[in-house]
Interface confidence: medium
């Protein structure tokens, strides 16, 4: 047991030695006067009046009594509906934002350590962002019959509608429905138009062939709170086989009538290949030849993004009201309560300061809404059938179907660089800047009001 005790004593001694060397004995406890040219330690601040390094208050607290040469900062808990998110020395906690409006949901409650965060409820999008959450929500537009969704709404962008092209229709008022192909009739009772499907006589109809169009299962978005069908092909893994010239089913998801013939085709083809392979194996083994390996590959070529999606013309504008990235903390001002966060960029991280978890506020539309050329969803499906025979007269036949899909869309996910956190240096202890709607609306692009005036030169057709 003695060696254990010796080791323990040595370890304790080493820790004490390291601590003593890391902090000179005379500045081990706050308040203390910093050595010339040095800065205060982590979770300490320099008090101008006392000219000492003093303790900061922890998140959820504020400075009740400032330090002196002989006494340290006295902290107190934030009152109800107020908070501090960082280590600080503010005389009063910040007020939590006002209650979420009826078109919003509270995604983060107001606590002593964090502000309330409001986001838009399903069916609405954020028209005006703030550093965290949303300042102003607006209802997603709805496309009336004859018009389908060209670009779905996201958390931060509105729906864009487009007229249904010839051969397609939409008979609903919806913020999610896309134009669907008319059914093809053996005998047409009533021809379809942009707002109505074709009506067939009693014989069974088939769905029209939309060139290059492939109906894919839609992924469930984990990013947006309102999941909606998108007009772009999904990038979710699929077990179904894709045929380049296969019929396009109605987009409302009734794929039952589509899956059966595809399954039959694939099954019969696979069975045929298998039989041919077995026959070949038997023939080859009988004529005592080397094992034969037949490798068949069936590939579906990359679908051109525009074909798979339906051509999206210049209407695919980015109509975001983007809040400028704001890296400053909610504790920049000791005075106030109401959203005094100001955009501060590219300022060096002060040493010994805890970074805020706030990050940058981004008005991003996610993968479905990246740059106009960035909708390059690629679908690559490979079917490989291997048929091999072995020399011991027992044929081994394996078939492998691999389905791979890639998405070239990129969703903006830049991380805040050089985040400036306040209260790191004595000269910026109490700074107050106001985040105004003017600064939020710094973008040169305008979001059209719901009912706008057409540009000059536009004339009815």
């Amino acid at each position: 047991m003695a060696p254990v005790a010796v080791w323990a004593a040595l370890a304790v001694g080493l820790e004490l030695w390291a601590a003593a060397h890391a902090l000179p004995a005379q500045v081990a406890f706050t308040p203390y006067a910093p050595e010339p040219g040095s800065t205060c330690r982590l979770r300490e601040y320099y008090d101008q009046t006392a000219q000492m390094c003093c303790s900061k208050c922890s998140p959820g607290q504020h400075a009740k009594v400032f330090c002196t040469k002989t006494s340290d900062t006295v902290c107190d808990s934030c009152e109800d509906s107020t908070y501090t998110q960082l280590w600080n020395w503010v005389p009063e906690c910040l007020s939590c934002g006002s209650r979420c409006s009826s078109d919003q949901v509270e995604t983060q409650a107001c606590t002593r350590e964090q502000n309330r965060i409001c986001t838009c409820r399903p069916g609405w999008y954020c028209a005006l962002s703030k550093q965290e959450g949303c300042r102003l929500c607006a209802p997603l537009r709805k496309c009336r019959p004859g018009f389908g969704v060209a670009r779905p709404g996201t958390e931060t962008s509105d729906v864009v509608c487009k007229p249904c092209a010839p051969g397609t229709f939409s008979n609903t008022t919806s913020s999610t429905d896309i134009c669907r192909p008319h059914q093809i009739c053996n005998v047409v009772a009533i021809p379809g138009n942009a707002s109505m499907d074709a009506v067939c006589t009693s014989t069974s109809p088939t769905r029209s062939m939309a060139p290059g169009a492939v109906h894919l299962p839609q992924p469930v978005s984990t990013r947006s709170q309102h999941t909606q069908p998108t007009p772009e092909p999904s990038t979710a893994p699929s077990t179904s086989f894709l045929l380049p010239m296969g019929p396009s089913p109605p987009a409302e998801g009734s794929t039952g009538d589509f899956a059966l013939p595809v399954g039959l085709i694939v099954g019969v083809t696979a069975l045929g290949l298998l039989i041919i392979g077995v026959v070949n194996c038997v023939i080859m083994t009988q004529v005592k030849k080397k094992p034969l390996c037949l490798q068949r590959e069936a590939k579906v070529p990359h679908l051109p993004a525009d074909k798979a999606r339906g051509t999206q013309g210049p209407e695919q504008q980015h109509l975001l009201i983007t809040a400028p990235s704001s890296s400053s903390s909610s504790l920049e001002s000791s005075a106030s309560a109401l959203d005094r966060r100001a955009p501060t960029r590219n300022q060096p991280q002060a040493p010994g300061v805890e970074a805020s978890g706030a990050g940058e506020a981004r008005a991003s539309t996610g993968s479905s809404d990246s740059s106009p050329g960035g909708h390059g969803t690629q679908v690559n499906v490979t079917c490989i059938v291997n048929v091999c025979s072995s020399s011991d007269h027992s044929s081994q036949c394996s078939s492998q179907a691999s389905s791979t899909m890639g998405d070239t869309d990129s969703s903006p996910s830049e991380s805040p660089k050089d985040e400036q956190v306040p209260f790191s240096k004595e000269e910026c202890a109490f700074r107050s800047q106001l985040e105004t709607p003017e600064t939020l609306l710094g973008s040169t692009e305008e979001k059209p009001l719901p009912l706008g005036v057409p540009d000059a030169g536009m004339k009815p057709s």
Epitope: G123, F147, A150, A194, P448, L449, P450, L451, P454, M458
Partner: antibody
Framework: QVQLVQSGPEVKKPGASVKVSCKAS????????ISWVRQAPGQGLEWMGW????????NYAQKLQGRVTMTTDTSTSTAYMELRSLRSDDTAVYYC???????????????????????WGQGTTVTVSS | EIVLTQSPDFQSMTPEEKVTITCRAS??????LHWYQQKPDQSPKLLIK???QSISGVPSRFSGSGSGTDFTLTINSLEAEDAATYYC?????????FGPGTKVDIK
């Protein structure tokens, strides 16, 4: 201010036709659609159809298909509704209403949205009697 | 076509009372339901769009709720000028249809 002014009352014989006008003012006519709604005496409202004032596209109620025609004259910002082969049960007050609208932008004709019938005409009484 | 039914057909209320009118759709229409007010010998007036969205210029005592098949129009504190017939209207799919109306009378 935004308003829709309709033509005066009409008395027609069964089998005849009637054409009701609806003149828009106070807004850009081609930025919106016009719906037509009728109300038989002591009855509720019945949607007859809609016309896209920008390009003239129409949707008609199935029961009126073949008898009704909706048109617009963009030069005078006027919408028209013609009903043919009139019957006694076509006796009603006919209303036009501004319905939906386009978003602004260079390609505004590609963005159509539904906003509800927010502005109504004063109504035109059509009486069908022999 | 989508059939809308309203209840009650008629409601006689005293001023400052709370009035509730319901509208039921024969199939789900999401939030594509609008409420109109029509006073005697006047044109209808849009009160609420898309089930719950208020219209500028309409008094705040009018509110709407619901989605799918069941919808409600509420008049929080009835005033004499609210005597009218109230219609629900669906724009979910063609043909657009109206409910039969609910007449509200002031005692």
């Amino acid at each position: 201010q935004v308003q829709l002014v309709q033509s005066g009352p009409e008395v027609k014989k069964p089998g005849a036709s009637v054409k009701v006008s609806c003149k828009a003012s106070g807004y850009t006519f081609t930025n919106y659609g016009i719906s037509w709604v009728r109300q038989a005496p002591g009855q509720g409202l019945e949607w007859m159809g809609w016309i896209n004032a920008y390009n003239g596209n129409t949707n008609y109620a199935q029961k009126l298909q073949g008898r009704v025609t909706m048109t617009t004259d963009t030069s005078t910002s006027t919408a028209y509704m013609e009903l043919r082969s009139l019957r006694s049960d076509d006796t009603a007050v006919y209303y036009c209403a501004r319905d939906g609208g386009y978003g602004s932008g260079t390609y505004h004709n590609d963005y159509y949205y539904y906003y509800g019938m927010d502005v109504w005409g004063q109504g035109t009484t059509v009486t069908v009697s022999s | 076509e989508i059939v809308l039914t309203q209840s009650p057909d008629f409601q006689s209320m005293t001023p400052e009372e709370k009035v509730t009118i319901t509208c039921r759709a024969s199939q789900s229409i999401g939030s594509n339901l609008h409420w109109y007010q029509q006073k005697p010998d006047q044109s209808p007036k849009l009160l609420i769009k898309f089930a719950s969205q208020s219209i500028s210029g309409v008094p705040s005592r009018f509110s709407g709720s619901g989605s799918g098949t069941d919808f409600t129009l509420t008049i929080n504190s009835l005033e004499a000028e609210d005597a009218a017939t109230y219609y629900c209207h669906q724009s979910s799919s063609l043909p657009f249809t109206f409910g039969p109306g609910t007449k509200v009378d002031i005692k």
